[in-house]
Interface confidence: low
């Protein structure tokens, strides 16, 4: 029998054989961390000769070469050091911005042993555009330097680097770039499991939250799937079992898929799982049309019954056919449910492709993806209804370009990964959905549709009132805690008489809750600076109320996201190691940040939070207020850095009874509270007959209107002290 020669050692590395020295066997080289094999593999041909992929000569000497990370091609509005052609593992590159520009991202990045830079792309931004400066990742070249609504930027990679992410991005109306950040990588680079798990988990958790943002099933319920919402998820698991996948690796593919299924079923979402193995042809082991696809035991059992030998007669990798079988399944389900029905249109679809190589038969898999996108009517509005995760395993023949082409492109998310081996894959699936702490009360979800009620649009909004008249507003920040202003309680009257009115789907009047305890900031004292001629001072104007019972989460009652928490990090789709400072840089990233508060009548009103130099000019106006501050010499005595400032130009001003309400912004269709309404120089409700009418200040008013809101980024120690076991805070 023919066999291939055995003189294939690699200096400094090792190799494995998929099927011994026989024809069809794949020889895979590996090197110690920080080195990569060249070539990566060889195939034993039927002629008894080794063939090296993409090699000109039949047998080149295999060597372990040092991994290097790509150099910046250009860095705008700043400098980087040192300037090298490429960087060795462990090497650092540092970034600094010119005056007037703020550094976003990582000031220092280190080259990691997988050929990838740690940290995030450094960008020097002045906050001038409609969208933030999208930056230029290391090794990339960008064309396009306008960041207005509708502007496009294009990226390409230098020399032999491969682009993953979006080659073209557009600045959208919501101030966010379309697609996902492009990254230029060495063809031999791969991802570490500890990076993939949170990236995959964040994206997946966001999808789960959108499917059905309710509590995680308690283990004691025996994983009973509670089918109680209209949201439904179809999960399609595609497992490569072509010849180049060893039987052992196929077992790990199966095990990883089982882990995934197990986790998915632990969420209270309606889910159907399809399982397809593929080589030259696909084999559907479980279809979403089968009622058993909703039953964890049936799904796991069909996974366990998947046989490596199922595909022994066809050993190619036909990714097109695998994805096409998903398309056919979708088509059948659409016929069954009816194309125009909500039942069909409300299903979210997630495809996870586990492969060890690029497709080598059956045509371009991209064609099947295009068909899938078309049948699901995926457009900007329905982008959340499809997620395709393309995971390459083994650094062999995995084609970055193809994986990138197949994976979804969503801002702040990654859907295409290459892992070093199946062990790494197993680690990823073990850790990716470990978000049990985060899904209980998914935060910052408001109904944005035109026919939603005010309370459905801002379900965190609550009214705080004594037995007599309404006094203050507040925001649910968990299912039992409300954040509000301390000055609402300055008369110190008995809190047992107070009530908190929370939204309730059953009643247009909401539901009343008693207050179990009020935690008022000890630093708040409205008369603290009376002897300095400052008649009222609102520093530390913050309070927390613990409700006597937990609020049942609903369309009308749901917490807002508090920045600097893991819950908000998930909603922002930021990487796991993010800090509080990262959140501040992302949310308050311009000199004028559009934000909102809720009016007495429940409607959402617009303001602009002034930052940097604009904050100074916004606050300076206070010196013109001679009644409250007769002999004020330093504005900062009154407007400390605890306050955000609004009230310029076309801003609405809050009324007296709106104190304590959230000052919030929208990012990625989620809402984040950055401040709370504290005090101002003008009350638009004064003298108006009802709560629907507000009077704008006359242009000639001295001082002009200004409003000051407690900045939650400046109250972190206090918030952490009292909410440490309620929310999961990030490092500062």
């Amino acid at each position: 029998a023919t066999s291939c020669p055995q003189n294939v050692n690699i200096s400094g590395g090792t190799f494995t054989l998929s099927h011994g020295w026989a024809p069809g066997s794949l020889l895979i080289y590996s090197c110690p961390q920080g080195l990569y094999p060249s070539p990566a593999s060889r195939l034993c041909k039927s002629s008894g000769q080794w063939q090296t992929p993409r090699a000109t000569r039949s047998l080149t000497k295999a060597v372990c070469k040092p991994v290097r990370c790509p150099a910046p091609v250009s860095f705008e509005n700043g400098i980087y050091t040192p300037r090298l052609g490429s960087y060795p593992v462990g090497g650092n590159v540092s970034f600094e911005c010119e005056d007037g520009f703020i550094l976003r991202g990582s000031p220092v990045r280190q080259c990691r042993p997988n050929g990838m830079w740690d940290g995030e792309t450094a960008v020097c931004d002045n906050g001038a555009g409609h969208c933030p400066n999208p930056g230029i990742s290391l090794g990339a070249v960008r064309t396009g330097s306008r960041f207005g609504h509708g502007d496009k930027v294009r990226y390409r990679c230098s020399s032999n680097l491969v682009l993953t992410g979006s080659a073209e991005r557009e600045c959208q109306g919501n101030g966010v770039w379309s697609g996902t950040e492009p990254i230029c990588r060495q063809p031999y680079s791969y991802d570490f499991p500890e990076d993939v798990a949170p990236a995959l988990g964040t994206s997946f958790s966001h999808m789960l939250g959108a499917t059905n943002p309710t509590q995680r099933t308690k283990e004691s319920l025996g994983r009973k799937i509670q089918i109680q919402r209209s949201g439904h998820l179809n999960l399609y698991l595609l497992l490569d079992s072509s010849q180049s996948v060893s039987e052992n690796d196929f077992l790990i593919f199966k095990e990883s898929a089982s882990l995934m299924v197990d986790r998915i079923f632990s969420f209270e979402i309606n889910v159907s799982v399809a399982i397809i193995t593929f080589a030259s042809e696909p084999k559907v082991l479980m279809s979403v049309l089968n009622v058993n696809s909703r039953d964890i035991t049936e799904v796991i059992s069909s996974l366990e019954n998947a046989k490596y030998k199922d595909h022994e007669n066809g050993t190619g990798t036909n990714t097109y056919a695998a994805l096409n079988s998903v398309y056919l399944m979708m088509n059948n389900q659409m016929q069954l449910l009816g194309m125009k029905t909500m039942a069909w249109q409300e299903i979210r679809h997630a495809i996870i492709l586990l492969t060890d190589g690029k497709s080598n038969m059956g045509g371009s898999p991209k064609t099947a993806v295009d068909q899938i996108r078309e049948i699901l009517n995926i457009n900007q509005k329905r982008n959340d209804y499809l997620d395709i995760y393309a995971i390459g395993v083994g650094k062999l023949d995995v084609d970055w370009r193809e994986l990138n082409e197949l994976g979804s492109k969503k801002d702040g998310e990654r859907h295409a990964f290459i892992l070093q081996d199946t062990k790494a894959l197993h680690q990823v699936f073990e850790h990716m959905l470990d978000v049990s702490k985060l899904t209980d009360t998914i935060c910052g979800v408001g109904n944005m549709s035109a026919n939603a009620s005010d309370q459905e649009r801002t379900p965190w909004h609550v009214t705080i009132k004594p037995k007599s008249q309404e006094t203050c507003r507040g925001a649910l920040i968990s299912d039992q805690w409300v954040l509000t202003a301390a000055h609402c309680f300055r008369d110190g009257n008995d809190h047992s008489l107070w009530r908190v009115n929370v939204g309730d789907p059953k009643s247009q009047w909401g539901k009343e809750f008693l207050i179990e305890k009020a935690v008022i900031s000890p630093g708040f004292d409205v008369f603290a600076k009376k002897n300095q001629g400052i008649l009222e001072f609102y520093g530390d104007d913050i309070a927390l109320l613990k409700l006597a019972q937990k609020v049942k989460m609903s369309t009308h009652a749901r917490p807002i996201c508090l920045p600097c928490t893991m819950e908000a990090n998930l909603a922002l789709r930021r990487p796991q190691g993010s800090t509080c400072r990262d959140h501040e840089n992302e949310l308050l990233n311009k000199q004028s940040v559009p934000a909102h508060f809720v009016a007495l009548n429940g409607s959402k009103l617009n303001i602009n939070l002034k930052m940097g130099v604009e904050w100074t000019s916004c606050a300076e106006v206070v010196s013109q207020e001679k009644t409250m501050f007769p002999n004020l010499t330093d504005v900062r005595e009154v407007v400390t850095d605890q306050f955000l400032c609004s009230g310029t130009q076309e801003d609405e001003s809050p009324c007296k009874g709106e104190s304590g309400g959230a000052v919030f912004l929208e990012r990625r269709f989620r809402f984040f509270q950055v401040g709370l309404v504290s005090w101002g120089l003008y009350n638009p409700c004064l003298g108006s007959a009802d709560k629907n009418s507000r009077k704008r200040a006359p242009r000639s008013k001295v001082p002009p209107p200004r409003d000051f809101h407690i900045n939650l980024f400046r109250m972190q120690p206090w918030l952490r002290q009292h909410l440490g076991d309620v929310l999961n805070f990030l490092p500062l």
Epitope: P717, P731, L732
Partner: antibody, heavy 119, light 106 residues
Framework: QVQLVQSGAEVKKPGASVKVSCKAS????????MYWVRQAPGQGLEWMGI????????TYAQKFQDRVTMTRDASTTTVYMELSSLRSEDTAVYYC????????????WGQGTLVTVSS | SYELTQPPSVSLSPGQTASITCSGD??????TCWYQQKPGQSPVLVIY???KRPSGIPERFSGSNSGNTATLTISGTQAMDEADYYC?????????FGGGTKLTVL
């Protein structure tokens, strides 16, 4: 497993400075804060300050504000505490301790570094 | 500045229940942690967030906190529990330790 390994004992003269290192391993360095606490012979624990390994931001106890500097090197997962203008009452064991958030406490401590200030 | 007060010493026989108190102004509104320190060793966290036990700490250690006083309770005290115990809380952004209590098991 989590380990915080501190540098060895130091003997310093009054007016000098000392720099103590604390090498962290076995966990995600940037997810946890690092605190410094000291203990004079036969005395109680005294908090000196905190450093955020991810960004390097610090908060010092009022008492040490002018004399202490805490830094970190994320590439080697090491934090440093430098105390200047040493006096004899600074003779103490200096501990680094890891903590997730204030209310979670300092869940892992280094073995301590004895600093002796003597003329 | 904020202060925490602990009794300097507590003595009891093995098997008895030890209660070590820690008092401070409105301490019940703050979270308290407790540390055990044996001679020549680094401190060990035994209670965090008033009453939670880190993994590896025996169930006989418990904590409570209300009003102006936090209490560490060790039920069925053993000879190995003989050590110094420190309470700790946060005031604004500063950690504050109590003076420590020497627990002697006779």
């Amino acid at each position: 497993q989590v380990q915080l390994v501190q540098s060895g004992a130091e003997v310093k003269k009054p007016g000098a400075s000392v720099k103590v290192s604390c090498k962290a391993s076995g966990y995600s360095f940037t997810t946890y804060y690092m605190y410094w606490v000291r203990q004079a012979p036969g005395q109680g624990l005294e908090w000196m300050g905190i450093i955020t390994p991810s960004g390097g931001s610090t908060t010092y106890a009022q008492k040490f504000q002018d004399r202490v500097t805490m830094t970190r090197d994320a590439s080697t997962t090491t934090v440093y505490m430098e105390l200047s203008s040493l006096r004899s009452e600074d003779t103490a064991v200096y501990y680094c301790a890891r903590g997730y958030e204030g209310s979670y406490g300092f869940d892992h401590w280094g073995q301590g570094t004895l600093v002796t200030v003597s003329s | 500045s904020y202060e925490l007060t602990q009794p300097p010493s507590v003595s009891l026989s093995p098997g008895q229940t030890a209660s070590i108190t820690c008092s401070g102004d409105k301490l019940g509104n703050k979270y308290t942690c407790w540390y055990q320190q044996k001679p020549g060793q680094s401190p060990v966290l035994v209670i965090y967030q008033d009453n939670k036990r880190p993994s590896g700490i025996p169930e006989r250690f418990s904590g409570s906190n209300s009003g102006n006083t936090a209490t560490l309770t060790i039920s069925g005290t053993q000879a190995m529990d003989e050590a110094d115990y420190y309470c700790q809380t946060w005031d604004s952004s500063t950690a504050v330790f109590g003076g420590g209590t020497k627990l002697t098991v006779l």
